[in-house]
Interface confidence: low
């Protein structure tokens, strides 16, 4: 089938005491094919500091994940989530504390 | 513009510890991830260590690993590597880069300084 | 870690020939990934080419760079005297980072 590009979401929520974890969620992509990571600074972020989702068919012929880490409150502006699919890549910012979800349709 | 100035090179014996320091200036220090590359006298590049803007995500090569410590003062704009149990290996020019955090690589080097690590 | 392969070690190059450099990664890396630096004798690097095929500021037009997975490559469509350095392909994919042995450019 052709290139189905994903649809990336970028959301927030309390952890514990000045920490929240950042969660970010590509949907509806096709090929299953998928890099998402979170960056800090511009760096991939260690594995063992990420939680990985499965890619899981989403019904619809194309795919879902996710990737999350937690990080210290205040710092939200240092971290971005990294995608690439297909030969494209965009990086989504962090949600500030009053805006939890950030779209994009990645074309 | 953007500088970078290392210092604190020069000989030590083998066993020995040396501390490198790094002043940074023209750019907003504390908002840039660091690192040390060093080049062993006609070899190749070698990356040392990497720390970010907040000095809560740090790398070692394997080589240096255990051994040195790269650490950082932004309020006073200086980067350090703390080098201890020195090998004839480690003679190297050490130099001090600047992250690029949009595009990644390596955007502003230092001059370097020489480490020299010599019975 | 991922070890960067550059090939060839040495490269004697006359003016105006067209030079090619391959970096080969031991695993696939993504392209926004990987970099090449130039280096003159006596001089700090400079960053080259950034995310494989961005040319970095007041780099001439004559440089390119390709590839992705595996195999990437900086070409020198017309080679110019200045051009003589050494070139070293450099991935932060995955910590350690780590940087190619290098490419020689020397004029025939």
């Known amino acids: 089938g052709s290139t189905v590009p994903p649809m990336v979401n970028v959301t927030r929520s309390e952890a514990s005491e000045g920490n929240i974890t950042v969660t970010c969620r590509a949907s509806s992509f096709y090929p299953r094919n998928i890099i998402l990571t979170w960056r800090q600074d511009g760096v991939s972020l260690s594995h063992d500091t990420q939680q990985w989702g499965d890619v899981l068919p989403d019904g619809n012929g194309t795919y879902q994940t996710w990737v999350a880490t937690r990080i210290c409150r205040g710092e939200e502006q240092r971290f971005t989530c990294y995608m690439e699919h297909s030969g494209n890549h965009s990086t989504h910012p962090v949600p500030s504390g009053n805006s939890h979800h950030h779209h994009h349709h990645h074309h | 513009d953007v500088h970078l100035v290392e210092s604190g090179g020069g000989l030590v014996q083998p066993g020995g510890s040396r501390k490198l320091s790094c002043a940074a200036s023209?750019?907003?220090?504390?908002?840039?991830?660091m690192n040390w590359v060093r080049q062993a006298p006609e070899k190749g590049l070698e990356w040392v260590a990497y720390?970010?803007?907040?000095?809560?995500?740090?790398y070692y090569a394997d080589t240096v690993k255990g051994r040195f410590t790269i650490s950082r003062d932004n309020p006073k704009n200086t980067l350090f590597l703390q080098m201890t149990s020195l090998r004839s290996e480690d003679t190297a020019m050490y130099y001090c880069t600047r992250w690029e955090p949009v595009t990644g690589g390596f955007s502003y080097w230092g001059q370097g300084t020489l480490v020299t690590v010599s019975a | 870690q991922i070890v960067l392969t550059q090939s060839p070690a040495f490269k004697s190059s006359s003016l105006g020939e067209r030079v090619t450099m391959t970096c080969t990664a031991s695993?696939?890396?993504?392209?926004?990934?990987l970099h090449w630096y130039q280096q003159k004798p006596g001089s700090s690097p400079k960053l080259w080419i950034y995310t494989t095929s961005n040319l970095a500021s007041g780099v001439p037009a004559r440089f390119s760079g390709s590839g992705s997975g595996t195999s990437y490559s900086l070409t020198i469509s017309t080679m110019e005297a200045e051009d003589a350095a050494t070139y070293y392909c450099?991935?932060?994919?995955?910590?350690?980072?780590?940087f190619g042995s290098g490419t020689k450019v020397e004029i025939k």
């Open positions: 695993s696939s890396i993504s392209s926004s990934y």
């Open positions: 023209g750019f907003t220090f504390n908002t840039f991830g």
């Open positions: 720390i970010n803007s907040g000095s809560n995500t740090i």
């Open positions: 450099h991935q932060h994919h995955r910590s350690p980072f780590t």
